[in-house]
């Protein structure tokens, strides 16, 4: 009678995470009697996966009908595979012994590789906002994928970026891997509507890459430009002075009028208009009663934008007999109705 052989026909098996792995094993003889056991790994630290004789192995089912009296098929199925299940599995025949069964013969082993999809890339930008012309860093992270090979690309508004660094960890063998990439992006004034995209391609994704996005609106701060103008007289002895706050982002803005250095009024931007590029415009006006002044008046529009140091623009209002001749005649936008008489 030929000596029993344990045959594992598959050198390797590749399974997607969440699926079921089938590990094949047959014996060439019923004799000697004793259980088949499946192990992951070899040597003293090997992990018992299934014991034909006893034990409870909820994830494991046998392929063949074990009630067959001449069963020599000891193939198993392992359900709900995760990357942690990767490794080499050995089908081992034991010979009955007293008090314990004795290892008799092992199959050559089957390497189980698990294909696991990367997690959705998470893109994060800088903690603080930055202004145009500055370079900011964005990071992209994705985890839990296997095998290790992966491709990561960065885009800004569909244009591929080249200034980035990527690491895949760990460097050595692992059940699953993570990718971390940092890209540098130069901000422009037009970036309020811009997006930075991190794109991850992996064999498990079947040509349909995963994308993570960050809106530059969360990152950029566009400081306003100010223009103070004197409008035509509305009535005798009254001058309308406007402060046009243009091209700012985000909307958080506080404006203060100063008359000869003294605070006249403070207001918060409310009814703003949005430009095509996503920035905002706002206008505030001040009605000045010139008859109350004997000297020239210095009017200052002071703007604090998004918690930054205030910027200001001043306008000298000359007190003379013909105030309506002074200043520019820029038409006022009907975006504010903040009138104030100064007495």
């Amino acid at each position: 009678e030929e000596e029993l052989q344990v045959i594992q026909p598959d050198k390797s098996v590749l399974v997607a995470a969440g699926e079921t792995a089938t590990l094949r094993c047959t014996a060439t003889s019923l004799i000697p009697v004793g259980p088949i056991q499946w192990f992951r790994g070899a040597g003293p630290g090997r992990e018992l996966i299934y014991n034909q004789k006893e034990g409870h192995f909820p994830r494991v089912t046998t392929v063949s009908d074990l009630t067959k009296r001449n069963n020599m098929d000891f193939s198993i199925r392992i359900g709900n595979i995760t990357p942690a299940d990767a490794g080499t599995y050995y089908c081992v025949k034991f010979r009955k012994g007293s008090p314990d069964d004795v290892e008799f013969k092992s199959g050559a082993g089957t390497e189980l590789s698990v294909r696991a999809k990367p997690s959705a890339p998470v893109v994060s930008g800088p903690a603080a906002r930055a202004t145009p012309q500055h370079t900011v860093s964005f990071t992209c992270e994705s985890h839990g994928f296997s095998p290790r090979d992966i491709t990561l690309k960065w885009f800004k508004n569909g244009n591929e970026l080249s200034d980035f660094q990527t690491n895949v960890d760990p460097v050595g063998e692992s059940v699953s891997y993570s990718i971390h990439s940092t890209a540098k992006v130069v901000l422009t004034r037009e970036d309020v509507h811009s997006q930075v995209i991190c794109e991850v391609a992996h064999v498990t994704l079947q040509g349909d890459p995963l994308r993570g996005t960050a809106n530059l609106s969360e990152t950029i701060r566009v400081p306003p430009t100010l223009e103070v103008t004197q409008q035509p007289v509305r009535a005798e002895n009254q001058v309308n002075v406007t402060c046009q706050v243009r091209k700012f982002y985000p909307q958080r803005l506080q404006l203060t009028w100063l008359e000869n250095g003294n605070v006249s009024r403070t207001e918060t931007a409310s009814t703003v208009t949005e430009n095509k590029d996503g920035t905002y415009n706002w206008m505030s006006w001040l009605l000045v009663n010139v008859s109350a002044h004997r000297d020239d008046v210095k009017l200052t529009c002071q703007v604090e934008h998004d918690g930054q140091p205030a910027v200001s623009k001043s306008h000298d209002l000359k007190v003379s007999a013909h105030p309506k001749e002074q200043g520019s005649n820029t038409a006022a936008e009907n975006t504010g109705s903040n009138e104030r008489n100064i007495y």
Epitope: I31, V33, Q52, T67, R69
Partner: antibody, heavy 120, light 106 residues
């Protein structure tokens, strides 16, 4: 409590046929292989036939191969033995026996037996 | 085909130890089972996988198996143990029984 109850035995002429039944209860019938074992008067036990839990695999002793057919109806928890071309040497008490499980099972439960007499 | 050989009869005095042997080629490489059958009754499993006792079987029943011989041992034999005993190789598609041994308690 596991119970196996054979029926269908009786007197039959040589060359005749008989169908034995074994009604099982007290266990999940489809999870176990089942066998027929016979014992001629004053003789020892002789295994006749076996069938796997699903019914997909059957086994026969050389002495009955081609004449006897084992089957099972798991929905009725019943085991059958169709015996054709009966001979005098088939005269015996026929026991239905349950396999003890999937790991080198013994016959852990037996029925009370049904007598088959083949005589002219 | 595989064959198992048992002595036709074994006698023992009450309280003594009875040993019933079962021989077969390399039987020690297989699992032996033992059945007890009293007159007019169905067989009852007393030992399986060489040494294991089903629940309800008294501790005086024990088994061993090595080389070419399996042995059923009944220590402190009682009158109620008088019966026919059959060995079986519990590992093949065809269940082979020994010829049986009649145990007589004198």
């Amino acid at each position: 409590e596991v119970q196996l109850l054979e029926s269908g035995g009786g007197l039959v002429q040589p060359g005749g046929s008989l169908r034995l039944s074994c009604a099982a209860s007290g266990f999940t019938f489809s999870s176990y292989a089942m066998s027929w074992v016979r014992q001629a008067p004053g003789k020892g036990l002789e295994w006749v036939s076996a069938i796997s839990g699903s019914g997909g695999d059957t086994y026969y002793a050389d002495s009955v191969k081609g004449r006897f057919t084992i089957s099972r109806d798991n929905s009725k928890s019943t085991l059958y033995l169709q015996m054709n071309s009966l001979r005098a040497e088939d005269t015996a008490v026929y026991y239905c026996a349950k396999d003890g499980g999937s790991y080198y099972p013994p016959f852990d439960y037996w029925g009370q037996g049904t007598l088959v007499t083949v005589s002219s | 085909s595989y064959e198992l050989t048992q002595p036709p009869s074994v006698s023992v005095s009450p309280g003594q130890t009875a040993s019933i042997t079962c021989s077969g080629d390399k039987l020690g490489d297989r699992y032996a089972c033992w059945y007890q059958q009293k007159p007019g009754q169905s067989p009852v499993l007393v030992i399986y996988q060489d040494t294991k006792r089903p629940s309800g079987i008294p501790e005086r029943f024990s088994g061993s198996n090595s080389g070419n011989t399996a042995t059923l041992t009944i220590s402190g034999t009682q009158a109620m143990d008088e019966a026919d005993y059959y060995c079986q190789a519990c590992d093949s598609s065809t269940a082979v029984f020994g010829g049986g041994t009649k145990l007589t308690v004198l």
